[in-house]
């Protein structure tokens, strides 16, 4: 489901996220700030003047500036969230929609090589949709998803860097690779 005017927001599985309301400043005129999770049309948090702040469960926290914190993101937190703000006269002064998408963070990529086959492999084990980039002495060699295999033809002594990234994280590994002329492991 795609909402065209939604703020695209990415969060990492297991981490906290703050849904900040852009261009909103809290003032005395604000009476009501209500957050909804739209898939089940359920109110999840609400601030009302002179009333106790409501939160549907402890994983939600509502700050005085209207920001909603969701703690320890789970896959079912991926949803469309709506915040509605009303003034003391009951007028809807602001409405924002957040399209929260969740990815698992990438793990540190593992670089391994064999001098016999003159082949280097970079692999990332965890993470949603990781993209890998391989560099040799600072020069970009290739990019791929999840696994990169690189074969060389000459004797090799070089520094390889492999970077794994997705929308919520990025991790790198660096390995100095040295192979003798004859190709011994």
């Amino acid at each position: 489901k795609e909402i065209t005017n939604a703020l695209e927001t990415w969060g990492a599985l297991g981490q906290d996220i703050n849904l900040d309301i852009p261009s909103f400043q809290m003032s005395d005129d604000i009476d009501d700030i209500k957050w909804e999770k739209t898939s089940d049309k359920k109110k999840i948090a609400q601030f009302r003047k002179e009333k106790e702040t409501f939160k549907e469960k402890d994983t939600y926290k509502l700050f005085k500036n209207g920001t909603l914190k969701i703690k320890h993101l789970k896959t079912d937190d991926q949803d469309i969230y709506k915040v509605s703000i009303y003034d003391t006269k009951g007028k809807n002064v602001l409405e924002k929609i957040f399209d929260l998408k969740i990815q698992e963070r990438v793990s540190k990529p593992k670089i391994s090589w064999t001098c016999i086959n003159t082949t280097l492999t970079c692999e990332v084990m965890n993470g949603t949709d990781p993209e890998l980039n391989l560099y040799q002495d600072g020069k970009h060699l290739k990019l791929s998803q999840r696994v990169i295999t690189h074969k060389w033809t000459t004797s090799l002594s070089a520094k390889f860097k492999c970077t794994a990234g997705n929308k919520v994280s990025k991790e790198s590994s660096v390995e100095p690779v040295s192979c003798p002329e004859k190709g011994l492991d």
Partner: antibody
Framework: QVQLQQPGTELVRPGSSVKLSCKAS????????VNWVKQRPDQGLEWIGR????????HYNQKFTDKAISTIDTSSNTAYMQLSTLTSDASAVYYC?????????????WGQGTLVTVSS | IVMTQSPATLSVTPGDRVSLSCRAS??????LHWYQQKSHESPRLLIK???QSISGIPSRFSGSGSGSDFTLSINSVEPEDVGVYYC?????????FGAGTKLELR
């Protein structure tokens, strides 16, 4: 809702430098690379380089390594590209665009472009 | 990687089915993206990874190919499709674009 806002025009003197800006909104700024692309009048597109707001990692087209420097201000969700020692060849429209870190070579959304005119 | 597009210009009639060609100087697997640029506008992404559709792009646009030969097809051209179409190498750096195919109405 995704927006990449660029100033419309910049008039600069030959030999001087210019710092182009690209203000992002409507998405998680640190989830996407910011790319810079040059387009001379009635000509094709030329990739200058890119920067990752997550950690300020940069990649440049070798042709522009001594000409362009990309920087980031995450507090204002703004990317900058400084072009130095400008000649008439630098007169062009400069676009910023974003590419997702998990499929980072497709330029998914573009700014309106800044027309840079190098003239004395 | 050098990207070569053909033809340079294509004159069409609304309703035509057209094919635009793009060739890479070496194999780039399916790391090929297509853009449309209308007059006085910014480019916009039409197709990514040779054949993957983009949200908001009309279904008449489709892409095919792998390796070094790629095709962008428009199955029934509309007047608003006039513009320049660019293919882009997304396989290795520097990212490179073709010179473009200009689509005009006959």
């Amino acid at each position: 809702q995704v927006q990449l806002q660029q100033p419309g025009t910049e008039l600069v003197r030959p030999g001087s430098s210019v710092k182009l800006s690209c203000k992002a909104s409507g998405y998680t700024f640190t989830s996407y690379w910011v790319n810079w692309v040059k387009q001379r009048p009635d000509q094709g597109l030329e990739w200058i380089g890119r920067i990752d707001p997550y950690d300020s990692e940069t990649h440049y087209n070798q042709k522009f390594t001594d000409k362009a420097i990309s920087t980031i201000d995450t507090s204002s969700n703004t990317a900058y590209m400084q072009l130095s020692t400008l000649t008439s060849d630098a007169s062009a429209v400069y676009y910023c665009s974003r590419s997702p870190r998990d499929s980072s070579t497709n330029l998914a959304d573009w700014g309106q472009g800044t027309l840079v005119t190098v003239s004395s | 990687i050098v990207m070569t597009q053909s033809p340079a210009t294509l004159s069409v009639t609304p309703g035509d089915r057209v094919s635009l060609s793009c060739r890479a100087s070496q194999s780039i697997s399916d790391y090929l993206h297509w853009y449309q640029q209308k007059s006085h506008e910014s480019p916009r992404l039409l197709i990514k990874y040779a054949s993957q559709s983009i949200s908001g792009i009309p279904s008449r646009f489709s892409g095919s190919g792998s390796g070094s030969d790629f095709t962008l097809s428009i199955n029934s051209v509309e007047p608003e499709d006039v513009g320049v179409y660019y293919c882009q190498n997304g396989h290795s750096f520097p990212l490179t674009f073709g010179a473009g195919t200009k689509l005009e109405l006959r």
